[in-house]
Interface confidence: low
């Protein structure tokens, strides 16, 4: 997957800090007080739809058959999204205030691609 | 997850018959000829982010609430892309022209969600 | 490109107010949510973490700086400002702005030294 | 607040040889570990975030490992410009601490 790097409007990853205070869940989450999770930015012209692909390979790519074809079904759009995530670990309270270590799945964004 | 109506610009699933002939592929698929794969489109607001929710479900909360503060992280979008997709049994010619029965994952959109 | 660039007197009298400067290029800060950390280093000695901002307005100190340290921002100007009162020569430093998350792009430092 | 312990203060070694550099966190930091060099004069440059991975434009060579409260910097094969002064940095907890430094020098 692409990095974005200012250089390109393609479907990249954009590095970006995520910051609990911001969004008030630092009363829950003890730590880390933030963390890069990243997100997904960029268009996704038909040459790319299914690249480096999703877990909709079969039909992204029929559909993007359709795509190259000019036969667009309905307003359907490619979308670039998360196509690989990883884990990170994390200390919180849970509802009962205890305080909990817990590998979470889906927090980073490592790779983009076009669904 | 909303099933396209017509009375809806949210994210919905819309039924769409995918046809091998037209897309050139029934020269190496046998049956079906073709078969109902739907796709996802709509709109995907602030508050169905994460709804019914995609694989990335901790890193869309988080983002959905940097959103829900006017804090967009550059121009991060929703999208409206399958949750949700089913197997279905195929008939082809692999690359050897041996005929193959097999059940094909991902054919099937059933269900749309904002990611 | 990110680039964060310190700014402020070299010289500051005892018990006065220290102030600096760290002016963002590369992104707007009313759109970007990235924050900044403030770190020193004495001569000769090693690195301390003074606090961090954020866009926001929110702030973290160093508990040992706390009641001294105040951060603000100016996201108008792409600027963060740090004040320290009643130094000493204890103060005397160079200062650093370094991007958010754990720190990737410095400043290159601005030298103050606490002096009568 | 989280105290940094880096180990050995100095490292006296020659060009070629392998640097291990030794950073221990009094509590657990999970991996929100960052190992940073400085030259003199120079702002500190970041060489391994997340405890293991190396940041944009880091030479192979360097390489970090560990978890929880003990981590390690592996230089394999020092370089000349690889003589200066180490930093661990922990940012799991406000406030963010660092670790005293360990100077790897020319012997």
């Known amino acids: 997957g692409l990095e974005c790097d200012g250089r390109t409007n393609l479907c990249c990853r954009q590095q970006f800090f995520i910051d609990f205070r911001l969004i008030g869940w630092n009363d829950w989450i003890i730590a880390p007080t933030g963390y890069y999770g990243n997100y997904c930015e960029g268009s996704c012209p038909a040459y790319l739809a299914g690249v480096p692909g999703s877990a909709s390979s079969f039909h992204t790519a029929v559909v993007n058959q359709y795509r190259m074809r000019g036969l667009n079904p309905g307003t359907v759009n490619s979308c670039c999204i998360p196509t690989k995530l990883s884990t990170m670990s994390m200390l919180y309270f849970d509802d009962e205030y205890n305080i909990v270590k817990r590998d979470v799945p889906n927090m980073i964004v490592e790779e983009c691609g076009c669904a | 997850g909303l099933e396209c109506d017509g009375r809806t610009n949210l994210c919905c699933r819309q039924q769409f018959f995918i046809d091998f002939r037209l897309i050139g592929w029934n020269d190496w698929i046998i049956a079906p000829t073709g078969y109902y794969g739907n796709y996802c489109e709509g709109s995907c607001p602030a508050y169905l982010a994460g709804v019914p929710g995609s694989a990335s479900s901790f890193h869309t909360a988080v983002v959905n609430q940097y959103r829900m503060r006017g804090l967009n992280p550059g121009t991060v979008n929703s999208c409206c892309i399958p949750t949700k997709l089913s197997t279905m049994s195929m008939l082809y010619f692999d690359d050897e022209y041996n005929i193959v029965k097999r059940d094909v994952p991902n054919m099937i959109v059933e269900e749309c969600g904002c990611a | 490109q990110v680039q964060l660039q310190e700014s402020g007197p070299g010289l500051v009298k005892p018990s006065q107010t220290l102030s600096l400067t760290c002016t963002v290029s590369?992104?707007?800060?009313?759109?970007?949510?990235?924050?900044v950390n403030w770190i020193r280093q004495p001569p000769g000695k090693g690195l301390e973490w003074i606090g961090y901002?954020?866009?926001?307005?929110?702030?973290d100190y160093n508990p040992s700086l706390k009641s001294r340290v105040t951060m603000s921002v100016d996201t108008s100007k792409n600027q963060f400002s740090l004040k320290v009162n009643s130094v000493t020569a204890a103060d005397t430093a160079v200062y650093y702005c370094?991007?958010?998350?754990?720190?990737?792009?410095w400043g290159k430092g601005t030298t103050v030294t606490v002096s009568s | 607040e989280i105290v940094m312990t880096q180990s050995p203060a100095t490292l006296s070694l020659s060009p070629g040889e392998r640097a291990t550099l030794s950073c221990r966190a009094s509590?657990?930091?999970?991996?929100?570990l960052a190992w940073y060099q400085q030259k003199p004069g120079q702002a500190p440059r970041l060489l391994i975030y997340?405890?293991?991975n190396r940041a944009t434009g880091i030479p192979a060579r360097f390489s970090g490992s560990g978890s929880g409260t003990d981590f390690t910097l592996t230089i394999s094969s020092l370089e000349p410009e690889d003589f200066a002064v180490y930093y661990c940095?922990?940012?799991?907890?406000?406030?963010?601490?660092f670790g005293g430094g360990t100077k790897v020098e020319i012997k």
């Open positions: 370094a991007r958010a998350g754990y720190p990737d792009v």
């Open positions: 590369g992104f707007p800060l009313s759109t970007s949510r990235m924050g």
């Open positions: 901002i954020n866009p926001s307005g929110a702030t």
């Open positions: 509590q657990s930091v999970s991996t929100h």
């Open positions: 997340d405890a293991t």
């Open positions: 940095l922990q940012y799991t907890n406000y406030p963010w601490t």
